[in-house]
């Protein structure tokens, strides 16, 4: 995270990532003021001439907002008084990536902090047994990723084993021509074992686990954003 306390108030940001097509949050907090009317929040983006967003005298002031952010930004107006200047960014675009500045003016003084915002696509993988295949096969699917991720299979029983020779991964471009569907197939699987399909790019890491026994199949998946320091 980035902290700037060289001015008279401290402003804190946290690096984050946005999922293309979904809503994102650019986090920023500051030392609160007693009067909402004394607080000015300005969000800037490096390389952009207009403002990303401005909030002053208790309401949005969008006369200087840059065209690329028109209708896509909002602050949490009811939380500004307690020091929350975070920005909600609607319908995240790939081009929203970059360096942002959260700039705060209050009756106590001024402060600012930068944050790096990454954009891409990431989704939870689902691992299933492929009953149509001639041998015991697992199929790992994740609908939306960008940039193109790496896919690695792992097994609880054969820890450290390299499954690249017995797996096949394909990337299929989605209809919006940016994100891709990830499909990875693992061959020659054995029962009474837990397999993990790990998908990772520079923005996120997602894992889909499947435990296959003679009596049941258990699935679990999780996704983690890989935040870099602002």
């Amino acid at each position: 995270f980035g902290i700037s306390g060289r001015h008279s108030i401290t402003v804190t940001t946290v690096a984050s990532a946005g999922n293309i097509g979904e809503d994102g949050i650019l986090s920023c907090t500051f030392e609160p003021d007693i009067k909402l009317s004394d607080i000015v929040i300005q969000w800037l983006k490096e390389g952009v001439l207009g403002l990303v967003h401005e909030f002053k005298e208790g309401k949005d002031e969008l006369s200087e907002q840059d065209e690329m952010f028109r209708g896509r930004t909002a602050v949490f107006a009811d939380q500004v008084i307690v020091g929350n200047a975070s920005l909600r960014l609607k319908n995240v675009q790939l081009t929203d990536a970059g360096t942002y500045k959260c700039y705060i003016i209050t009756s106590k003084g001024k402060g600012n902090a930068n944050l790096e915002y990454k954009t891409g696509a990431f989704s939870m993988p689902e691992v299933n047994v492929d009953y149509n295949a001639s041998s015991e096969t697992l199929r790992c699917e994740a609908p939306r990723w960008f940039p193109q991720p790496t896919v690695v299979w792992a097994s609880q029983v054969d820890q450290g084993a390299n499954f690249s020779e017995v797996s096949n991964t394909s990337f299929e471009l989605n209809s919006e021509n940016v994100t891709m569907k990830v499909v990875s197939v693992l061959y020659n699987v054995t029962i009474n074992n837990t397999y993990s399909c790990m998908i990772e790019n520079d923005i996120a890491k997602a894992t889909g686990d499947i435990k296959v026994t003679e009596s049941e199949i258990k699935r679990r998946s999780h996704l983690q954003l890989l935040n870099s320091k602002a």
């Epitope: 060289r6 001015h7 000015v40 800037l44 490096e46 390389g47 952009v48 001439l49 207009g50 200087e64 840059d66 065209e67 690329m68 081009t95 970059g98 500045k101 700039y103 003016i105 001024k110 600012n112």
Partner: antibody, heavy 117, light 105 residues
Framework: EVQLVESGGGVVQPGRSLRLSCAAS????????MNWVRQAPGKGLEWVSA????????YYADSVKGRFTISRDNSKNTLYLQMNSLRAEDTAVYYC??????????WGQGTTVTVSS | SYELTQPPSVSVAPGKTARITCGGN??????VHWYQQKPGQAPVLVVY???DRPSGIPERFSGSNSGNTATLTISRVEAGDEADYYC????????FGTGTKLTVL
């Protein structure tokens, strides 16, 4: 090393046109907004124009609006200033400068434009 | 449009402290930058965001900003500091101060 090098200045008659260039190196050009700033002989600094990193948005000083056009070619790392209908009061050293938030952190060495009959 | 006013000249003896002011309506709510320009050279950023120094700029250069006045302070002035100094803010474009000539006596 971050560097900005202006070119294209010269002596031109009133009413004529001139195009200035600014070659950038040492940074990711498309990530940064850029400015043109000028300085008439013996006078102070006067901002002329700014352009966003993508080139999608531009701002102009009232004194040049409608006559000057700022543009950029990110594939060539080059900033331009097309100056039409030049006047004697446009005589100045023209600097290109990299925008950093609300200020400018890197300047070129400048190119001289003289408008005279 | 927004205007920034600076004194035309400031004189100071070597080793002393020079203060250059920049006046503007409620300038304390804006981010102020200062540039040094020596004869025949391009401007150089010496203070940004009111009081921060770019790398390579001596600690002798500092800035402050509140109310209607921003100030550039140069302590232990040297002969090499003799130059024109400009303040600047952003207001839908770069707005420069009128400039101050610093003379080292």
């Amino acid at each position: 090393e971050v560097q900005l090098v202006e070119s294209g200045g010269g002596v031109v008659q009133p009413g004529r046109s001139l195009r200035l260039s600014c070659a950038a190196s040492g940074f990711t050009f498309s990530d940064r907004a850029m400015n043109w700033v000028r300085q008439a002989p013996g006078k102070g600094l006067e901002w002329v124009s700014a352009i966003s990193g993508t080139g999608a948005s531009t701002y102009y000083a009232d004194s040049v609006k409608g006559r000057f056009t700022i543009s950029r070619d990110n594939s060539k790392n080059t900033l331009y200033l097309q100056m039409n209908s030049l006047r004697a009061e446009d005589t100045a050293v023209y600097y290109c400068a990299r925008k950093r938030w609300y200020g400018m952190d890197v300047w070129g060495q400048g190119t001289t434009v003289t408008v005279s009959s | 449009s927004y205007e920034l006013t600076q004194p035309p000249s400031v004189s100071v003896a070597p080793g002393k402290t020079a203060r250059i002011t920049c006046g503007g309506n409620n300038i304390g709510s804006k981010s102020v930058h200062w540039y040094q320009q020596k004869p025949g050279q391009a401007p150089v950023l010496v203070v940004y965001d009111d009081s921060d120094r770019p790398s390579g700029i001596p600690e002798r250069f500092s800035g402050s900003n509140s109310g209607n006045t921003a100030t550039l302070t140069i302590s232990r002035v040297e002969a090499g500091d003799e130059a024109d100094y400009y303040c600047q803010v952003w207001d839908r474009g770069m707005i420069f101060g009128t400039g101050t000539k610093l003379t080292v006596l």
